[in-house]
């Protein structure tokens, strides 16, 4: 009988043999930032290193009653929830606990930042296998912390945090803000979001990935074998770091930004009953809850790619929203959405040597959002070919004209108010994939990439009579990088990828009084690389 | 995730006063900037991070510091430097009365000013 | 080898009180922990408490609390349970037995027959 | 409090039968269960340590099994000095140690 949540990220293979994944997570440490825990406790004693960092405020009141087990409680369930003998998710990892949360699991900024330095201070002097740094806390959004937190990210280190208990945006949040932390909420064992009294998980943009988070079995600190059930994102944050350890264990050379592909990509999809979040929250909320690889093979050979959406641009008329991809991936391609349907597109521009998605909003727009396709492509060279507007009634054109580059996304940006009142173009021409075409009174954007062995190809799905939504999705073993809506007209909401669906979304027609006559369709682009292909097939 | 323009509380305190002469002056146009939770229940005022420019040297932690300290007595302040960061970001952390920031701010080498808040288990 | 060989049972009359003795040789006194258990005539197992003799600390069973009391004599590698107030319903072979907390109880003395009776 | 209920109460077997007694915790315990026999007039011996290990000396016809909250204490093949009371134990914290009510195995 293994608890629902062990259950629940094990793939159908493993679950035969009880819960007995390979290895363990035993190349890997995970440091744990939280209250001091019970070293002893059979469920990690012998694998827990109790370091001797120690930086808490003062507890709370002037009858306060430091009582150990009370002080232990909440380190100690997580310390087994990652790593527990019987109730963890990474039985063989090991764990070197800090402790930066009082007895009423209280801390400060200050406290943690001096923690993770303590982290990297190790790290230089005994340089070890992969790190994991767990961070089963939250404060208010801040700066420096998250900082920080990208620093030693930086340095090779992966982070995981609890997206926070508020019932909130985890973007308001720290670190759940950071791009860099892999962000955790909770579902429960139906796959809903977990109510918290009368708050719960947070949700939005800055979430990564789902985990368990409610009703987790796990070691508690009033005795040496007892268990407890407990409740939270920082349980949810412990079955990724456990599920992180055991990736990392297999796959040692493993960076941030491989890893978090490779936690998307397994993660079950689509499962998580949105209703339970804010409507304005729900697109930006991914549903993803994390689950172990179904095996340990070298995954490598699948081009991943996520979605990253940029924080929501204001109302006034010239905001912009960018999204950025992370350190080690390659925007393939950009798109936009505005729920007013008012927005003058996007576009690839460079930053810093490095290129970010930019969405434009318009006039009387309420806000737009910028959506990143980021990927993961050794050897990938990409460059942005643009079209003005044409002006003609075919609309704009523009393709992907070097040797050896293939189309992988379109974007389209436009500086009149409303392309509605202008005359659409027909739908792109059959048998031309590296061609993208868009509204003639827009600048066409193509995103043209080289990588060995990279091929594409442009999937459509049009439907004559309007839709407030339109799907197109890659077929096993292509992937999407590319997601785009024709035409440009004004009743578009904008598109995005969601896994390796391409979404375009319009507005209700019957309520903007727009003839049936304007259909949509949704063009996805869908890659793969032979080249990592044959790479996996020489290493099978 | 967030941007660092993002939703927090920021108050930009662009000052080029130059009571403390020119050595205490930032470069030219530059302003340092301070921020602080926007939870109010969970500020911590009284210790603030001081956070230096990213290719600040590691020495020049310990002597903005000082610098600080210096300062501030003369002008009647007791300050207490907790903590000198070197491995993660250049900066310090210091506790002082809320009275010192406008003087803090104008610290060479200061790229923003935060002040501590509490985080909690989740 | 590991021996821990009871003493001190016998019949007492209702209201009475003894000390029963556990003597223990064969390993380091200080590592284990000795619980004390009693099983009455025909029935099963029963913890009253246990005294780990590193440190002198004890824990009772909340119905033996006012009842029961153990300590230790290190020099003599001995442990003690005093039982006062004693009713028929306290007859019952005692036993000592010593384990790591959260550990199995992995040696047991031979047990002490406790008789309460006028 | 964990309650750990036996079955069967009592069991009557012949020898070179097998026995098969279970335990189940109104708790998860992970595989923190210790199993006990005890013949009359002897003190409990540990038979099984953490769910399914067996303690030194213990012959290998006695096994265990099971983690979380169902066990089982298996004996493949009785023979006549396996007739006896067996218990099983776990850790709590109030009180710290809790024993099952037992089950007798007795000759047909």
């Known amino acids: 009988s293994i608890p629902w949540n062990l259950e629940r990220i094990t793939p159908a293979r493993y679950r035969a043999d009880e819960y007995q994944p390979p290895k363990g997570g035993s190349l890997v440490e995970v440091y744990l930032l939280d209250t001091s825990i019970q070293s002893d406790h059979r469920e990690i004693e012998g694998r827990v290193m109790v370091t001797d960092f120690e930086s808490v405020p003062e507890e709370d009141g002037t009858r306060f009653h430091r009582q150990a087990s009370k002080c232990d409680s909440h380190g100690t369930h997580l310390a087994g929830v990652v790593s527990g003998r019987d109730a963890g998710v990474a039985k063989g990892a090991g764990l070197r606990s800090l402790r930066v949360l009082n007895c009423q699991g209280k801390g400060t900024v200050s406290g943690t930042l001096i923690g993770l330095e303590f982290i990297r201070k190790s790290q230089l002097v005994q340089p070890v296998g992969p790190l994991v740094v767990l961070l089963p806390l939250a404060g208010g959004y801040s700066r420096v912390f998250n900082a920080a937190c990208q620093r030693l990210a930086r340095a090779g280190v992966v982070l995981v945090t609890a997206a926070g208990n508020f019932r909130d945006d985890a973007c308001l949040y720290s670190p759940a803000s950071a791009p860099e932390v892999i962000t955790v909420g909770a579902t429960n064992a139906q796959d809903q979001p977990v109510t918290l009294g009368t708050l719960g998980t947070n949700f939005g943009r800055c979430v990564d990935l789902f985990a368990p988070g409610e009703d987790i079995i796990g070691a508690s600190s009033d005795c040496s074998t007892c268990f407890v059930s407990r409740s939270g994102t920082s349980q949810a944050a412990a079955h990724v770091a456990g599920i992180a350890a055991m990736m990392l264990s297999a796959e040692p050379e493993l960076t941030l930004a491989e890893l978090r592909q490779r936690l998307i990509h397994f993660s079950a999809k689509d499962v998580i009953n949105e209703a339970w979040f804010p409507e304005d929250q729900r697109v930006l909320t991914p549903n993803l809850v994390a689950a172990l690889p179904p095996s340990t093979h070298r995954a490598g050979w699948q081009l991943f790619c996520r979605t990253v959406w940029s924080a929501h641009s204001g109302p006034t008329r010239m905001a912009t929203a960018v999204a950025r991809c992370a350190q080690d991936e390659e925007l393939l391609s950009c798109s936009s959405f505005s729920r007013s349907g008012k927005r003058r597109g996007e576009r690839i521009e460079a930053q810093g040597g490095k290129r970010v998605c930019r969405a434009h909003n318009a006039f009387g727009g309420e806000g737009v959002y910028a959506i990143a396709r980021c990927c993961l492509l050794p050897q990938v060279n990409c460059s942005v070919h643009t079209a003005p507007p044409a002006g003609a009634s075919m609309g704009t054109r523009v393709h992907c004209h070097q040797q050896g580059h293939v189309l992988t996304g379109c974007s389209s940006h436009w500086e009149v108010e409303d392309l509605g009142t202008h005359k659409p173009p027909v739908l792109r021409p059959r048998g031309q994939p590296n061609q993208c075409v868009g509204h003639r009174e827009a600048s066409i954007h193509a995103s043209c990439c080289h990588a060995p062995g990279l091929e594409c190809k442009v999937k459509e799905h049009g439907i004559p009579a309007p839709q407030e939504q339109v799907i197109v999705a890659c077929e096993d073993g292509w992937t999407l990088t590319g997601c785009s809506p024709l035409p440009g007209t004004s009743h578009v909401l904008g598109a995005y990828a969601v896994d390796n669906t391409c979404v375009v979304r319009s507005r209700d027609v019957s309520t903007t009084g727009s003839t049936s006559k304007e259909a949509v369709a949704a063009v996805a682009i869908c890659c793969r690389s032979r080249h990592l292909v044959q790479a996996s097939q020489e290493l099978q | 995730q967030e941007d660092e323009d993002g939703d927090y509380e920021e108050l930009v305190l662009a000052l080029r006063s130059e009571e403390d002469g020119l050595a205490d002056a930032p470069e030219h146009g530059a302003t340092a900037t301070f921020h602080r939770c926007a939870k109010d229940p969970w500020r911590l005022p009284g210790t603030y991070v001081v956070v230096l420019k990213e290719e600040t040297h590691r020495s020049q932690s310990e002597r903005t510091a000082r610098r600080l300290q210096a300062q501030a007595a003369r002008r009647g302040y007791l300050t207490k430097i907790l903590h000198v960061f070197h491995h993660l970001l250049p900066g310090f952390l210091v506790k002082m009365s809320g009275d010192l920031l406008e003087l803090a701010l104008k610290l060479p080498h200061v790229d923003y000013i935060e002040e501590d808040s509490s985080v909690f288990a989740q | 080898q590991v021996q821990l060989l009871e003493s001190g049972g016998g019949l007492v009359q209702p209201g009475g009180s003894l000390r029963l003795s556990c003597k223990a040789s064969g390993y380091t006194f200080s590592s284990y922990s000795i619980y004390w258990v009693r099983q009455a005539p025909g029935k099963g197992l029963e913890w009253i408490g246990w005294i780990d003799p590193g440190n002198g600390g004890t824990r009772y069973n909340q119905k033996f609390q006012s009842k029961a009391t153990i300590s230790r004599d290190n020099s003599k590698n001995t442990l003690y349970l005093q039982m006062n107030s004693l009713r028929a319903e306290d007859t019952a072979v005692y036993y000592c037995?010593?384990?790591?907390?959260?550990?199995?109880?992995?040696?047991w003395g031979q047990g002490t027959l406790v008789t309460v009776s006028s | 409090e964990i309650v750990l209920t036996q079955s069967p109460a009592t069991l009557s077997l012949s020898p070179g039968e097998r026995a098969t007694i279970t335990c189940r915790a109104s708790q998860y315990v992970g595989s923190y269960l210790n199993w006990y026999q005890q013949k009359p007039g002897q003190a409990p011996r540990l038979l099984i340590y953490d769910a399914s290990n067996r303690a030194t000396g213990i012959p290998a016809r006695f096994s265990g099994s099971g983690s979380g909250t169902d066990f089982t204490l298996t004996i493949s093949s009785l023979e006549p000095e396996d007739f006896a009371v067996y218990y099983c134990?776990?850790?709590?914290?109030?009180?710290?140690?809790?024993f099952g009510g037992g089950t007798k195995v007795e000759i047909k």
């Open positions: 134990q776990v850790w709590d914290s109030s009180p710290p140690v809790v």
């Open positions: 037995a010593r384990a790591r907390v959260g550990y199995s109880l992995d040696y």
